[in-house]
C-alpha cells in the first residue's frame, strides 16, 4: 500500500519511515526494513504506570511496570525507527523554570533519544500546535541532531489539539497511554498506559494513525474529505486483531479521534468507549482526569451527555456496577463537581442501581514548586469483558475536535491462572486506587472542592 499521498500533503508515503533530512524541503524517506516486517509476531502486552513520588500505597499493593523503565527499555530495543506522537514535550526541569531532582529521569530520556539519533536510528515526532510548554527546547535539540519534527496545526484544522500520546518503535513495538513526553509524567503525575512488544500487526496499524498526523504537519495541509485507501485500517471493533499474547487468546484494536482523522475502517474513539460500556454486564470502572458532559474549551459551552447517558443507562437498565474515579488537584476546574454529584445521585441500591463517584487526590507534599503536577492523569476503563486504555479526557472536545487514540483489549480467561488477563490486571489497579486513602467520596470533600489532600 505504498501509494503517494496527494501532493498538497507533502512527499510522505504512509508506510515510509521518516529518516533524515533531504536536500530540499521534502524529507528523504526509507521504507521499514523488510526483514523487520517478516519477523514472526509474539505479541506481549505490559501495563505500565507512573506513581508520583511520595504517594505510597498499602504494603503488598499491586503495581504495574514503572513507565520510565518501560520507555528506556523500548528505546533500548529500537534498531530502525522511533515515531512519537505527543501533545507537548518538556523533558527537562529548566523548561518550566524548576530545579528539582525528580526531573532527572526525563533528562535521561532526552539523552537516550539523542544517543539513538547518534546511532542513525530515525526519530519522527508529531506534536501539537497549539501546545503547552512553549519554552521547551527538547524538540530543537533533537531536530538539530536529525530528528524530524512536525507541528500539526490542529487548532487550525479542527479547532482542537493533538492530544495523542503514543510511540511506534521499529514498526513492531508500541507504547500508548496517558503520559506526554514530560518529566513530570515520570515522577510527579500519576499515569497509566500499555506497552506492546513484538506485535507488528498492531504496530503497523497504529502507525497509520501516526501517518495521518504526519501528513497534516506539512505547511498548508488540509483535512482530506476522504482519506486515501492506504490509510485505511482492517483492524477495528468489528474485526479486531486476534492473536496469542504470551499464550493468552487476545483480541485488540486501536480507535482514534476525532472522526475527521479516522480513515475508512478506523473505529472512532467515542464509538469504542460506548461499545465497551454497552457490552458490560457486571461492572464498569473508569479512571479519568476530567469528566464533563459538556464541551470543554469552546464558547459557549454545549451540553453533551453521550458518555454520561451511557453510564446511567448501564447502571439503570442493566444493573451494571459503575464506579468513576476522577482526578482532583490544584488545576482541577471546580465546575466539574455538580456533574459528578448529578451522576452519583442516580445511585439507588434498593433498585439495584449502583453508581459511585470518587475523586483521587495526589498529596502535593513538598512538591508545590512543580506546576501542573501531583494529579492523576490516567484515562482508562475496565469491564469484566474488556480493558480500554486511552489518551482522552471525558468531554466532547476530546472526541469531536482533538486527536486521541484508544486501545481496546479482551483476553480469554481460559487456561491461564486467574488474574492474568489484561482486564483483570487493570481491574486490580483500579481497585487499588479506588480503595486507597487518596480516593475520597464526593461527600468527603470540603464544600469548596479545593482538592487539597486532607490526610
Amino acid at each position: 500500500w505504498q501509494v503517494r499521498c496527494p501532493p498538497t500533503w507533502g512527499q510522505v508515503q504512509p508506510r515510509d519511515v521518516p529518516r533524515s533530512w533531504g536536500h530540499g524541503s521534502s524529507l528523504a524517506l526509507e521504507p521499514l526494513e523488510a526483514e523487520v516486517r517478516k519477523q514472526r509476531d509474539s505479541c506481549q502486552l505490559v501495563l505500565v504506570e507512573s506513581i508520583p513520588q511520595d504517594l505510597p500505597f498499602a504494603a503488598g499493593s499491586l503495581s504495574a511496570q514503572p513507565l520510565g523503565q518501560a520507555w528506556l527499555q523500548l528505546l533500548d530495543t529500537a534498531q530502525e525507527s522511533v515515531h512519537v506522537a505527543s501533545y507537548y514535550w518538556s523533558l527537562t526541569g529548566p523548561d518550566i523554570g524548576v530545579n528539582d531532582s525528580s526531573s532527572q529521569l526525563g533528562e535521561a530520556l532526552l539523552q537516550k533519544l539523542q544517543q539513538l539519533l547518534g546511532r542513525n536510528i530515525s526519530l519522527a515526532v508529531a506534536t501539537s500546535s497549539p501546545t503547552l510548554a512553549r519554552k521547551s527546547t527538547d524538540l530543537q535539540v533533537l531536530a538539530a541532531r536529525g530528528a524530524q519534527v512536525r507541528r500539526v496545526p490542529m487548532g487550525r484544522l479542527t479547532r482542537g489539539v493533538l492530544h495523542s500520546k503514543f510511540w511506534v518503535v521499529d514498526g513492531r513495538h508500541i507504547y500508548m497511554g496517558s503520559a506526554n513526553m514530560d518529566w513530570r509524567s515520570l515522577t510527579q503525575v500519576k499515569e497509566l498506559g500499555a506497552v506492546i512488544y513484538n506485535c507488528s500487526h498492531l504496530a503497523q496499524d497504529l502507525e497509520k494513525t501516526f501517518q495521518t498526523y504526519w501528513v497534516l504537519g506539512v505547511p498548508k495541509a488540509v483535512l482530506p474529505k476522504t482519506w486515501p485507501q492506504n490509510f485505511s485500517s482492517h483492524i477495528n471493533r468489528f474485526q479486531p486483531f486476534q492473536g496469542l499474547f504470551d499464550g493468552v487468546p487476545t483480541t485488540a484494536y486501536f480507535s482514534a479521534s476525532p472522526p475527521a482523522l479516522c480513515p475508512q475502517g478506523r473505529t472512532p474513539d467515542l464509538e469504542a468507549l460506548l461499545a465497551v460500556m454497552g457490552s458490560a454486564q457486571e461492572f464498569i470502572y473508569a479512571s479519568v482526569m476530567e469528566y464533563f458532559p459538556t464541551t470543554r474549551f469552546s464558547h459557549p459551552r454545549r451540553y453533551w451527555p453521550v458518555l454520561d447517558n451511557a453510564l446511567r443507562a448501564a447502571a439503570f437498565s442493566k444493573g451494571v456496577r459503575v464506579r468513576l474515579l476522577v482526578s482532583c488537584g490544584l488545576n482541577t476546574d471546580p465546575t466539574m463537581f455538580p456533574y459528578l454529584r448529578s451522576l452519583q445521585a442516580l445511585s439507588n441500591p434498593a433498585a439495584n442501581v449502583s453508581v459511585d463517584v470518587k475523586v483521587f487526590i495526589v498529596p502535593v507534599g513538598n512538591h508545590s514548586n512543580i506546576p501542573f503536577s501531583r494529579v492523576n492523569h490516567s484515562k482508562f476503563m475496565v469491564t469484566e469483558k474488556a480493558a480500554y486504555i486511552g489518551t482522552s479526557n471525558w468531554s466532547e472536545d476530546y472526541f469531536s475536535s482533538t486527536t486521541g487514540v484508544g486501545l481496546v483489549v479482551t483476553q480469554s480467561p481460559g487456561a491461564q491462572p486467574a488474574g492474568a488477563t489484561v482486564q483483570e490486571q487493570l481491574r486490580q489497579l483500579f481497585e487499588r486506587d479506588w480503595s486507597s486513602r487518596y480516593a475520597v467520596g464526593l461527600d468527603g470533600q470540603a464544600p469548596g472542592q479545593d482538592c487539597v489532600w486532607q490526610g
Epitope: P130, T131, N331, G448
Partner: antibody
Framework: DVQLQESGPGLVKPSQSLSLTCSVT???????YYWSWIRQFPGNRLEWM?????????NYNPSLKNRISITRDTSKNQFFLKLNSVTTEDTATYNC?????????????????WGAGTTVTVSS | DIQMTQTTSSLSASLGGSVTISCRAS??????LNWYQQKPDGTVKLLIY???RLHSGVPSRFSGSGSGTDYSLTISNLEQEDIATYFC?????????FGGGTKLEIK
Amino acid sequence: DVQLQESGPGLVKPSQSLSLTCSVTGYSISSHYYWSWIRQFPGNRLEWMGYISYDGSNNYNPSLKNRISITRDTSKNQFFLKLNSVTTEDTATYNCAREGPLYYGNPYWYFDVWGAGTTVTVSS
Amino acid sequence: DIQMTQTTSSLSASLGGSVTISCRASQDIDNYLNWYQQKPDGTVKLLIYYTSRLHSGVPSRFSGSGSGTDYSLTISNLEQEDIATYFCQQFNTLPRTFGGGTKLEIK
C-alpha cells in the same frame, strides 16, 4: 461575577516606592489563574509587569525585574504591586488583571477580567 | 521580547460598514494572539483569543484571522458601541507584550 479593583496613592515622588492593591471579589486568588499587573502609559502603550500565581509563585517582566515585587494576602483576597525607585517614566494607569484559565492541559492564555485601573503620577 | 506592532494608530469607518485592524509580531507567534477592546472610559474586555476564537458573550460581528507574524481583527456591521481602542497581545512567550493600539472612530 469576578471583579478586580485597584487602589493606592495617585501621586508618588520620584525615587520613592509605588504601592498598589488589587482587591478581588467573586473568586479566590488561591484557587486558579495568574493575577497580573499591567500598566498603560500616556499615549496608550500597554506593558505587562508581572504576575503572582494561585500558588504564590511570581514571574516579572525582565525590564522591571530588579524594581518590582508582587505579593498577596489570601485572607483578604488581595494582591499587591510594589515598584521601587520610581521616575516620571513610571507615570501610567495601573490595571490588575486575571490571566488564565489555569486548567490542566489548556493551551490558551488570556486576560479575561480587568480592573478599571488607577492613575499614578510620579512627580515631585 | 516579542514586539507587537499595530501600524494604524487610528482609523474611521461608517456605521453598518466593516473595518479590519492589523497587528504584526516581530517573530512567528504560532497563532498565540489575543485581541482586546478598551472603551473610552478605560474599561478593557477580551474579544478574541488564539487568533480566531470568540470569547464568551462577544458578538459574532467580531472575527479574527492570521498566522505566523501577521494577524487581523475584523468588525463587520459596525455599531456605535464599537467606538474603542483595540489592542493585540501575544501569549507565545513571557513577557506578554501588546500592540500599540488602534483607535476606531465612526465617520
